[in-house]
């Protein structure tokens, strides 16, 4: 079952995936000016078994002068901006599979992808959150949060995580913000389930052991 | 629960053009791409092209792209395809569906061209 | 562009059979196989998606199966409301493309 909802989202803080449940579906997805192949894929999924997953198929990037079938409206501006956390910069060191059966590692860069990943979770799936670069972590409880079905209907659990400025005062548990959407948009419009390939992890030492996962595996 | 509501039919004359609507509901519409597929009866399913309504990326199977124009609405969650130039050959059932495996389909628009 | 066939455009079954209709592909398409139902109405349904994977609120009676360029839809135990055309599909190169269809009917 896919989770239909993106994981929540935590202001100054980005989630990210470990390892991806058998059943994920990564969109193929190009950079500006480039299109999928000729009888290029869609799609990838990550299947298998418990004992072995892999991603079916790959994505590939052409330039889009290259042919003559295209036609692309005008980006919005969020689109056309530079990345920022999104920026792929080097592959990741993806977690040690041995120890998640089931489960797919990060797919490496295809050349000219998007600046953003699009993957399309299932149920099961868990997704951890660190502060972003210049917020330090006030923990309740675990940075991290689970796609669950509950009723016949997908909901992600939500993250004990409060990301703070070194110069505010720290706020108490229980006196969340409310949650901000990036570049102030409404939730349903935000980018859909932005996972990134690279973290570039500048968090403080002093964040916890949810940070330790983050700067062991992917720095 | 997961809908994609389309109208029943479309009445056009040849050498005019249709727009045509898909609302979705029950999901956040940015999130999957949007498919639109043609029934003419007799005749296999044929896949027109899809639409990323979060970045309004489109791709198109070369048989329609001088036919189809793809487009979506972020703010009222609602995707449409204008088809242009028509003739009694797009006379057909027009399908709009979600995801790259189509997991939901609309009810589709009956389109009649006629003078 | 991959050519998909339904060899067998209609079929005649009674209730409580097993039914199997197949796909055969112009290429190794790699799994990426969906079925279909369409009702009488229009009404359109994913089944089944890469091969064997049930979309969530199918029957289990629905299976599928199959690999490379040819594979297989199975409908253990037919129901009345099982009635209809399926179409078998391949996602795993654009443009994707249809089955002709199998029109299934009861005797």
């Known amino acids: 079952e896919l989770c239909d909802d993106d994981p929540p989202e935590i202001p100054h803080a980005t989630f990210k995936a470990m390892a991806y449940k058998e059943g994920t579906m990564l969109n193929c997805e190009c950079k500006r000016g480039f299109r999928r192949i000729k009888s290029g894929s869609l799609y990838m999924l990550c299947t298998g078994n418990s004992s072995h997953s892999s991603w079916d198929n790959q994505c590939q990037c052409t330039s889009s002068a290259t042919r003559n079938t295209t036609k692309q409206v005008t980006p919005q501006p969020e689109e056309q901006k530079e990345r920022k956390t999104t920026e792929m910069q080097s592959p990741m060191q993806p977690v040690d599979q041995a120890s998640l059966p089931g489960h797919c590692r990060e797919p490496p860069p295809w050349e000219n992808e998007a600046t953003e990943r699009i993957y399309h979770f299932v149920v099961g799936q868990m997704v951890y959150y660190q502060c972003v670069q210049g917020y330090r972590a006030l923990h309740r409880g675990p940075a991290e949060s689970v796609c669950k079905m509950t009723h016949g209907k997908t909901r992600w659990t939500q993250p004990q995580l409060i990301c703070t400025g070194e110069m505010e005062t720290s706020q108490f548990p229980g006196e969340e913000k409310p949650q901000a959407s990036p570049e102030g948009r409404p939730e349903s419009e935000t980018s859909c389930l932005v996972t990134t390939t690279d973290f570039q992890i500048q968090t403080e030492m002093a964040a916890t052991m949810e940070t330790s996962i983050f700067t062991t595996e992917y720095q | 629960q997961v809908q994609l509501q389309q109208p029943g039919a479309e009445l056009a004359k040849p050498g005019a053009s249709v727009k045509m609507s898909c609302k979705a509901s029950?999901?956040?519409?940015?999130?999957?791409?949007i498919h639109w597929v043609k029934q003419r009866p007799g005749q296999d399913l044929e896949w027109i092209g899809y639409i990323n309504p979060r970045t309004d990326y489109t791709e198109y199977n070369q048989k329609f792209k001088d036919k189809a124009t793809l487009t979506a609405d972020k703010s009222s969650s609602t995707a449409y395809m204008q088809l242009s130039s028509l003739t009694s050959d797009d006379s057909a059932v027009y399908y709009c569906?979600?995801?790259?495996?189509?997991?939901?389909w609309g009810q589709g628009t009956t389109l009649t061209v006629s003078s | 562009d991959i050519q998909m066939t339904q060899t067998t455009s209609s079929l005649s079954a009674s209730l409580g059979d097993r039914v199997t209709i197949s796909c055969r592909a112009s290429q190794d398409i790699s799994n990426y196989l969906n079925w279909y139902q369409q009702k009488p109405d229009g009404t359109v349904k994913l089944l089944i998606y890469?091969?064997?994977r049930l979309q969530s609120g199918v029957p289990s009676r629905f299976t599928g199966s199959g690999s490379g360029t040819d594979y297989s839809l199975t409908i253990s135990n037919l129901e009345q409301e099982d009635i209809a055309t399926y179409f078998c599909?391949?996602?795993?190169?654009?443009?994707?493309?249809f089955g002709g269809g199998t029109k299934l009917e009861i005797k």
């Open positions: 029950g999901y956040t519409f940015t999130r999957y791409w």
């Open positions: 569906a979600r995801h790259g495996y189509f997991d939901y």
């Open positions: 599909q391949q996602s795993n190169s654009l443009p994707p493309t």
């Open positions: 890469h091969t064997s």
